[in-house]
């Protein structure tokens, strides 16, 4: 059922990385426009992306208000020339999204190795603490601020001259590892939230190797 030439949205999908959160859907509109609404389970519906011909809507501003809440969105379809028109049941056609809990489901963005410093046979590797769009008291929180000790990093490191990888883990943004003197090492890190059931791991960071820009060496 529905208004002539108006089709309901389908394939509603949440795309979220480090809490930057966009709802996507199909189809590309032909003679129709969309409006999105978002709500928590116990809250009121809030309309976003009014009468748009896009098939995506940035809902970041809403979900960062409380990233531990579970959100539901719905996409309304209207005829392009007559947005007051409704479906046969007396309301516009709409489709519900899956539920989405940002804290549990947002993808962890690719981390970046900020620096590494060698002192003798130890190397300190620091991972950049990326800023998110989550705000408290008018300041943006970092990934570590939001996740605390739920977030760990895994370091993969290996001698430049070989392929055998070693791993280390930290619940901070720093690693202190033992290395062989006189050897150059390469590093890559991955963000992990072990307590999660989905989206537990980020992609690996770009590889950084000793003897390049980011490193510092001290005897």
């Amino acid at each position: 059922s529905g208004t002539t030439n108006t089709v309901a949205a389908y394939n509603l999908t949440w795309k979220s990385t480090n809490f930057k959160t966009i709802l996507e859907w199909e189809p590309k509109p032909v003679n129709q426009v969309y409006t999105v609404q978002i709500s928590t389970k116990s809250g009121d519906w809030k309309s976003k992306c009014f009468y748009t011909t896009d098939t995506e809507c940035d809902l970041t501003d809403e979900i960062v208000k409380d990233v531990k809440q579970t959100y539901l969105a719905r996409v309304f379809s209207y005829p392009a020339g007559n947005v007051e028109s409704t479906g046969s049941a007396g309301e516009p056609l709409y489709e519900n999204s899956p539920e989405f809990t940002p804290y549990l489901e947002t993808n962890l963005g690719q981390p970046t190795i900020q620096s590494f410093e060698q002192v003798g046979t130890k190397v300190n590797v620091t991972v950049e603490d990326e800023r998110t769009l989550v705000r408290r008291n008018n300041t943006f929180l970092s990934l570590r601020d939001v996740f605390g000790k739920d977030l760990i990093y895994t370091l993969y490191y290996w001698k430049s001259s070989s392929s055998g990888k070693k791993t280390a883990k930290t619940n901070t943004n720093e690693f202190l590892i033992d290395v062989d003197k006189g050897e150059n090492y390469c590093f890559s890190v991955q963000a992990v939230i072990p307590s999660r059931t989905v989206n537990r791991k980020s992609t690996d960071s770009p590889v950084e190797c000793m003897g390049q820009e980011k490193g510092e060496f001290r005897e």
């Epitope: 990233v67 531990k68 603490d129 605390g148 000790k149 901070t172």
Partner: antibody, heavy 120, light 111 residues
Framework: KQSVEESEGGLFKPTDTLTLTCTVS????????VSWVRQAPGNGLEWIGT???????YYASWANGRFTISNDNAPNTVSLQVNSLAAADTATYFC??????????????WGPGTLVTVSS | ELDLTQTASPVSAAVGGTVTINCQAS????????LSWYQQKPGQPPKLLIY???TLASGVPSRFSGSGFGTEFTLTISDVQCDDAATYYC???????????FGGGTKVVVE
């Protein structure tokens, strides 16, 4: 207005069990943690423990076992239970909100405190 | 045992002057920066001044500033006012899941 407030303390006898309640308003316990801190008369602040926004609890090593923090009873309350009270537990007890929601030590909203006196 | 050692009390400050309070941790605080500073006046609960070593809490005058990393931290009060007379505490989270600790406190007397 966001606030936290402790329930009434009072006079207790050694070996009694104390239960204090922290009532929060204006924010959600699913997003913020709550810590309990105490201060004996004329002394400094002493962290007892924290319940984080996921409901996990953390305790000072000296408090483990005798102190229990929970938020089972109502959606806007956090309880502190202290078993086998002793004179050394005499203090003003504060609850406070953890700014980040985990056990971060950044406590941005405090209750006025409630005095608990343990004496025979 | 985790330990936060603060500047010994009391610390005297003149109105308009600057006062510095140090806080030394027995091991690195969580992620080297999760250390907070509090002000407490008699009969009142503590008030958060600084969190994450250097971030000013909401509504706190910019005369208060924090610095430090790892195990050494400093609270600085510039242009000291009579109203700044209070006891100041540092508090830190640690990498160990269960631990948060307060320093012993530093009393500031304004002359």
């Amino acid at each position: 207005k966001q606030s936290v407030e402790e329930s009434e303390g009072g006079l207790f006898k050694p070996t009694d069990t104390l239960t204090l309640t922290c009532t929060v308003s204006g924010f959600s316990l699913s997003y913020y943690g709550v810590s309990w801190v105490r201060q004996a008369p004329g002394n400094g602040l002493e962290w007892i423990g924290t319940i984080d926004s996921s409901g996990r609890t953390y305790y000072a090593s000296w408090a483990n076992g005798r102190f229990t923090i929970s938020n089972d009873n109502a959606p806007n309350t956090v309880s502190l239970q202290v078993n086998s009270l002793a004179a050394a537990d005499t203090a003003t007890y504060f609850c406070a909100r953890d700014f980040y929601g985990w056990n971060s030590g950044a406590l941005d909203i405090w209750g006025p405190g409630t005095l608990v006196t343990v004496s025979s | 045992e985790l330990d936060l050692t603060q500047t010994a009390s009391p610390v005297s400050a003149a109105v308009g002057g600057t006062v510095t309070i140090n806080c030394q941790a027995s091991q690195s605080v969580y992620s080297n920066k999760y250390l907070s500073w509090y002000q407490q006046k008699p009969g009142q609960p503590p008030k958060l001044l600084i969190y994450k070593a250097s971030t000013l809490a909401s509504g706190v005058p910019s005369r208060f500033s924090g610095s430090g990393f790892g195990t050494e931290f400093t609270l600085t009060i510039s242009d000291v006012q009579c109203d700044d007379a209070a006891t100041y505490y540092c508090a830190a989270a640690y990498s160990d899941d269960s631990d948060t600790a307060f320093g012993g406190g530093t009393k500031v007397v304004v002359e």
